[in-house]
């Protein structure tokens, strides 16, 4: 049984996405804009001594000999997203000793490329998704998740790392993007905005959603995150948009109800194991996929992004709790922790379903659809 959560099943950018509201400045697509140095770095901040790389904090990278088969959340880079170009972030300031990549913030100095040169790469994340331009790839099969329904014990670590809230996942959560494309989940974290301001990292036709969840995975071809960073397909992130619905989402409440305990930057608590798949959309067959990067320094490329077409619904109160409870460094609220969208630079976003055909209410005129590349090869 799945907990009721996501009602929206129209293509992204449709119906309940809030398209009737005029988009704010920060909702405008910036995919065509060249990356700005002041944009907050990606969504994975590199592991320092204690913090792993970006997409929030990747589990700490441990020597292979130590607990060889056991991946830790710390082994993944922590990647955080910078705010919109128009609104530099004042939170998620990293000032701890250790790797240089731990010294970064959203929307201010130092410029991310100075923190990590990869942040100036050509194939960065997040991006603006335009369903009409996506290439339909029938070879993209439904995602397969195994072992995501965790028992209450052992408990899991929930941490405010200063740029997101991150849940460290235990060994045994397996995910397949397709035959021979197998991964292990390491951690999940969220990106959000502020009161009345959306904070998803990816956008759809320029529309920014209230929040976004990222589940970070390591390819089974690699034993450690540091080996996989920058390697094509070494890391994979499942991303889903969160938006407002009429009911409380009981799966998310198991995490959101604990945020007060970790309001202070660097604090952590333990939470009962839960059904991680219940935090994601129920439709694993309809998604967009492209190759990008961590959304926070080190901004390592080669990351396979899978963005669900279906959204997850949280109540207004839950979204408020998410955006208004945590504190970052320097007595600043942890808000607007997203990176500006980055240019595609010729990349083609693939879709597992015919997203470009009569699917987006925002489509104004017919466009030339991209052809599907050799997906799954």
């Amino acid at each position: 049984q799945r907990l009721p959560r996501m009602q929206e099943d129209s293509p992204l950018g449709g119906g309940s996405s809030g398209e009737d509201d005029p988009l704010g400045e920060e909702d405008l697509p910036s995919e065509e804009d060249s990356p700005r140095e002041e944009d907050p770095p990606g969504e994975e901040d590199l592991p320092g001594e204690e913090d792993l790389p970006g997409e929030e904090d990747l589990p700490e990278v441990k020597p292979k000999s130590e607990e060889e088969g056991s991946l830790k959340l710390e082994d993944l880079p922590t990647v955080e997203a910078p705010g919109d170009p128009q609104e530099p972030q004042n939170n998620a300031h990293r000032d701890k000793e250790g790797d240089d990549q731990s010294h970064w913030r959203y929307g201010g100095d130092p410029p991310w490329p100075r923190v990590s040169p990869a942040c100036a790469g050509r194939f960065q994340s997040p991006v603006d998704i335009r369903p009409q331009l996506a290439a339909f790839c029938p070879a993209l099969r439904p995602l397969e998740l195994l072992g995501f329904q965790l028992p209450p014990l052992p408990e899991l670590r929930l941490r405010n790392n200063g740029h997101s809230v991150q849940l460290t996942l235990p060994p045994g959560l397996e995910m397949a993007l397709g035959p021979g494309r197998e991964y292990r989940a390491l951690q999940l974290h969220l990106h959000w905005g502020a009161a009345g301001r959306p904070g998803s990292e990816h956008t759809v036709e320029g529309h920014r959603f209230p929040a976004e969840i990222h589940v970070v995975h390591l390819s089974t071809a690699f034993a450690r995150v540091d080996e996989a960073l920058g390697r094509p397909g070494g890391l994979a992130v499942l991303a889903a948009f969160l938006e407002e619905g009429p009911e409380e989402n009981s799966a998310y409440e198991q995490l959101l109800s604990r945020l007060e305990e970790i309001a202070e930057e660097g604090s952590e608590t333990q939470v009962p194991g839960l059904d991680i798949s219940a935090l994601l959309p129920s439709d694993f067959s309809r998604y967009f996929q492209y190759e990008g990067s961590l959304t926070t320094p080190p901004c390592a490329q080669g990351v396979i992004w899978t963005v669900f077409n279906q959204t997850v619904m949280l109540s207004a109160k839950q979204l408020h709790t998410l955006s208004d409870t945590l504190w970052g460094p320097g007595d600043s609220r942890l808000q607007l922790n997203f990176r500006a969208t980055q240019p595609l630079n010729g990349r083609v976003i693939e879709a597992s379903f015919p997203a470009g055909v009569d699917s987006s209410p925002r489509a104004a005129e017919p466009v030339q659809l991209n052809s599907c590349l050799a997906a799954g090869d």
């Epitope: 907990l3 028992p151 209450p152 014990l153 408990e155 059904d275």
Partner: antibody, heavy 124, light 107 residues
Framework: EVKLVESGGGLVQPGGSLRLSCATS????????MHWVRQPPGMALEWLAF??????????QYSASVKGRFTISRDVSQTILYLQMNTLRPEDSATYYC???????????????WGAGTTVTVSS | DIQMNQSPSSLSASLGDTITIACHVS??????LSWYQQKPGNIPKLLIY???NLHTGVPSRFTGSGSGTGFTLTISSLQPEDIATYYC?????????FGSGTKLEIK
């Protein structure tokens, strides 16, 4: 044989304090989550607090009804569990049970060993 | 908090009967449910864990079933020593919550 023996109950005035103890034996104390559960006369059971095992850092967790007033702790060397109860109210009157919970190999919380209980009466 | 709705609150049955006690939970708890027996003047004792697993030393006439939000405890071939109050308890997340109890009496 696994044994849990509570002590420290008694009559106390509203606003007063008590410290309950639970002497344990027959198992590896540090491996287990330990709980306090109470039962007012003729009423249902109510979980109050637990303290995690060594692997989880001996951190506590409380129910909303006692958070800020009660403190759970453990003396690992003497294998004793404690419940410090402050600002007691008449509605805290109950039999208090020391209970063994999950351990490193458990996959959820159930209460497999219970002490005989100690009675707390809060009255003026 | 997860709410536990136990029914009936009391029931009377004859020796040798089969009786069923229900526990409805306010949200999906998978199989993370336990059943306890508390005889008059005694402490609670674990009967069933993980919805259907019999605890050590518990007679096989006690069986548990269910998952998600609906659970049942069945006692077959009722015996005099089964006179007690029975409680369900969720172990999915804290605060851990118990049902209000079902008092079983012999006719």
């Amino acid at each position: 044989e696994v044994k849990l023996v509570e002590s420290g109950g008694g009559l106390v005035q509203p606003g007063g304090s008590l410290r309950l103890s639970c002497a344990t034996s027959g198992f590896t104390f540090t491996d287990y989550y330990m709980h306090w559960v109470r039962q007012p006369p003729g009423m249902a059971l109510e979980w109050l607090a637990f303290i995690r095992n060594k692997a989880s850092g001996y951190t506590p967790q409380y129910s909303a009804s006692v958070k800020g007033r009660f403190t759970i702790s453990r003396d690992v060397s003497q294998t004793i569990l404690y419940l410090q109860m402050n600002t007691l109210r008449p509605e805290d009157s109950a039999t208090y049970y020391c209970v063994r919970g999950g351990h490193a190999g458990s996959n959820y919380w159930y209460f497999d060993v219970w002490g005989a209980g100690t009675t707390v009466t809060v009255s003026s | 908090d997860i709410q536990m709705n136990q029914s009936p609150s009391s029931l009377s049955a004859s020796l040798g009967d089969t009786i069923t006690i229900a526990c409805h939970v306010s949200q999906n708890i998978n199989v993370w449910l336990s059943w306890y027996q508390q005889k008059p003047g005694n402490i609670p004792k674990l009967l069933i864990y993980q919805a259907s697993n019999l605890h050590t030393g518990v007679p096989s006439r006690f069986t548990g079933s269910g998952s998600g939000t609906g659970f049942t405890l069945t006692i077959s071939s009722l015996q005099p020593e089964d006179i007690a109050t029975y409680y369900c308890q969720q172990g999915q997340s804290y605060p851990f919550t118990f049902g209000s109890g079902t008092k079983l009496e012999i006719k």
